[in-house]
């Protein structure tokens, strides 16, 4: 029987060119974490195996750093960031449990407010 | 370097045994998960078995469960595959492959020929 | 089981054209798709995992692009040693699965 819960950092916003920390946790249960993968929108980002260690996707490497943790940092955002993004948390004896993320990535905060408060 | 060397395979008949052997060297062969695919003369490739890196978990194509046991010695750095009740359809170059983060097979053997046939 | 649909089955080609082989699966299967190649006598050898991610060693002319069911290897300027057979592999859930494999000839 499956008990555990994947905790996130659920919908999360962050600037153009700046970086993101993704985070998952899992909780609720005694079950050993085998691997983690991370993938965004039917791509893989990346995965940390406990006896392999971090696998990072050759096309993401330069943006993508292993950590904290479990967790992926995204370096150098786009818009193109934007989107869905899930950790695959890969436990023995529970099973896959699976967290979800929306990144938003925004222009520039400048851009966001000039946008709303525009001075007559 | 990362090798792989099949041993095990001949001639057997029908309802016969065999166990193959893949010794592997050149990496920490306890972190991987190791899986056995077979090729039968002039055809395509077939997923046999795998095994996680410690032996936890096993699982089998349904052509071979009941009859084929995967098994590995850590200490031995050595995967095998038992192969009881062989059949003429086993006839295959029986290929080990190391398979990191469960998701491709990235070293493979030689292979080694069984060939079933009375 | 995922059925996975290899096309076309032969090709001829020549040095320097471009070559596609695709690759269907019967249900998705996310980015759990990879790529190998076999000569004649030999063990096949990785070129694409992940659908699209350049196995180490394997050269550039090589890339893999695809994910949910359809999926696509691309020899962007084939070379002599490239005449070979291609097979597309699904990873995704047991048991894995082939494709029946594309033999590149030369023309």
């Known amino acids: 029987m499956m008990t555990g819960t994947i905790e996130t950092t659920g919908n999360i916003s962050a600037e153009k060119g700046g970086s993101i920390i993704l985070q998952c946790h899992l909780s609720s249960t005694t079950a050993q974490v085998t691997q983690v993968n991370w993938e965004q929108q039917d791509q893989l980002l990346a995965i940390c195996n406990a006896d392999l260690g971090w696998h990072i996707s050759p096309s993401f490497k330069d943006r993508v750093a292993p950590g904290p943790g479990l967790g992926l940092t995204l370096q150098s955002l786009t818009v193109n960031d934007t989107g869905e993004y899930f950790c695959i948390y890969h436990t023995y004896p529970d099973g896959t449990y699976t967290g979800r993320i929306f990144l938003e990535v925004l222009e520039s905060s400048v851009a966001e407010h000039g946008a709303r408060f525009q001075i007559p | 370097e990362v090798q792989l060397l099949e041993s095990g395979g001949g001639l057997v008949q029908p309802g016969g045994s065999l166990r193959l052997s893949c010794a592997a060297s050149g990496f920490t062969f306890s972190s991987y998960s190791m899986h056995w695919v077979r090729q039968a003369p002039g055809k395509g490739l077939e997923w046999v078995a795998a095994i996680n890196s410690n032996a936890g978990s096993s699982s089998y194509a349904d052509s071979v469960k009941g009859r084929f046991t995967i098994s590995r010695d850590n200490s031995k750095n050595t995967l095998y595959l038992q192969m009881n009740s062989l059949r003429a359809e086993d006839t295959a170059v029986y290929y080990c492959?190391?398979?990191?983060?469960?998701?491709?097979?990235?070293?493979w053997g030689q292979g080694t020929l069984v060939t079933v046939s009375s | 089981d995922i059925q996975m649909t290899q096309s076309p089955s032969s090709l001829s080609a020549s040095v320097g054209d471009r070559v596609t082989i695709t690759c269907r699966a019967s249900q998705s299967i996310s980015y759990y798709l990879n790529w190998y190649q076999q000569k004649p006598g030999k063990a096949p050898k990785l070129l694409i995992y992940a659908a699209s991610s350049l196995q180490s060693g394997v050269p550039s002319r090589f890339s893999g692009s695809g994910s949910g069911t359809d999926f696509t290897l691309t020899i962007s300027s084939l070379q002599p040693e490239d005449f070979a057979t291609y097979y597309c592999?699904?990873?995704?859930?047991?048991?894995?699965?082939f494709g029946g494999g594309t033999k590149v000839e030369i023309k």
């Open positions: 492959a190391r398979v990191p983060y469960g998701v491709w097979m990235d070293y």
């Open positions: 592999q699904q990873s995704y859930s047991t048991p894995l699965t």
